[in-house]
């Protein structure tokens, strides 16, 4: 379970400046390598599963909570970053 | 399993209040907003608001803001919605809901009927 | 708020027929980022509560019979039921899931003859 670090912090923290997190490109999804040894590490639900969650926002998988968060564009709220905060 | 589980109907008088219930199970009660959805006997659907169930933070449908209240209990994985100054109407089936992976509301509760009525 | 507008109000058809339903709303569900429409349908049967059917516009939600169908884009959706059944008995609401407040159609009830 995550401490103080709440969905709503994490949103605040990480929301001041539009995000720019990197996704693959069609021709690398799929074809990505596994990272370390192994079993590797598992897929980023947020790329698959989660892909469209967020209107406004960029998705981060709270592994804690096994629930995605969004981590809304500045001035959006909500539990998929919905609401424009007036 | 995901599973909403929601209080009884009720009865009540014009001007009280009632606090309907909504728990949780099969998932992490705090991973997740909840959502409260009115259904009016004309079948017409409107969203009333969604609470944070880690935070308490809610945002309201600016419709309800005066009629809603929204709380939960994070120990019993329980969801409330208060509605005060009933009247006739407030009658209508109450759902809480959850999004699923695809975004829009995948998991609903059976629906709570509130008739209110002198 | 959006304003979703659905169209007919009701339909009664034959087991095995084709159906159409429109959904309109008042501002875009095209999310311009992304080029996603955020446009959901529900079938709700009596006295049961909404089961999500489409999302997206054009996704069905997993377990939905191949039969529904989501199209459309920007403010004009559709929903069709290629050969419709005797248990698609329901009212189907279209639903803007973009923004605050979440705003439901009024619902086109679908009756079988």
């Known amino acids: 379970d995550l401490q103080e670090a709440d969905l709503d912090l994490l949103r605040v923290t990480l929301s001041s400046k539009p995000q720019a997190l990197a996704t693959p490109n069609k021709e690398e999804h799929g074809k990505r390598k596994k990272k370390g040894k192994g079993l590797g590490k598992k897929r980023d639900p947020c790329l698959r599963k989660y892909k469209d969650f967020c209107i406004h926002g960029e998705c981060k998988y709270v592994k804690e909570l096994r629930a995605p968060s969004c981590i809304c564009h500045p001035g959006y709220h909500g539990e998929r970053c919905h609401g424009l905060s007036l | 399993e995901v599973q909403l589980q929601q209080s009884g109907p009720e009865l009540v008088k014009p001007g009280a209040s009632v606090k309907i219930s909504c728990k949780a199970s099969g998932y992490s009660f705090t991973g997740y907003y909840m959502h409260w959805v009115k259904q009016s006997p004309e079948k017409r659907l409107e969203w009333i608001g969604e609470?944070?169930?880690?935070?308490?933070?809610?945002t309201y449908n600016q419709k309800f803001k005066a009629k809603a209240t929204l709380t939960v209990d994070k120990s019993s994985s329980t969801a409330y919605m208060q509605l005060k100054s009933l009247t006739s109407e407030d009658s209508a089936v109450y759902y809480c809901?959850?999004?699923?992976?695809?975004?829009?509301?995948?998991?609903w509760g059976q629906g709570t009927l509130v008739t209110v009525s002198a | 708020d959006i304003v979703m507008t659905q169209s007919p109000s009701s339909l009664s058809v034959s087991a095995g027929d084709k159906v159409t339903m429109s959904c309109k709303s008042s501002q875009s569900l095209l999310n311009s980022r992304n080029q996603k429409n955020y446009l959901a349908w529900y079938q709700q049967k009596p006295w049961q509560p909404p089961k999500l059917l489409i999302y997206?516009?054009?996704t069905r939600e997993s377990g939905v019979p191949d039969r529904f169908t989501g199209s459309g884009s920007g403010t004009d959706f559709t929903l069709t039921i290629s050969s419709v059944q005797a248990e698609d008995l329901a009212v189907y609401y279209c639903q803007n899931d973009y923004s605050y407040p979440f705003t439901f159609g009024t619902g086109t009830k679908l009756e079988i003859k």
């Open positions: 609470i944070n169930p880690r935070t308490g933070i809610t």
């Open positions: 809901a959850r999004v699923g992976s695809s975004g829009p509301f995948t998991y």
């Open positions: 997206g516009a054009s």
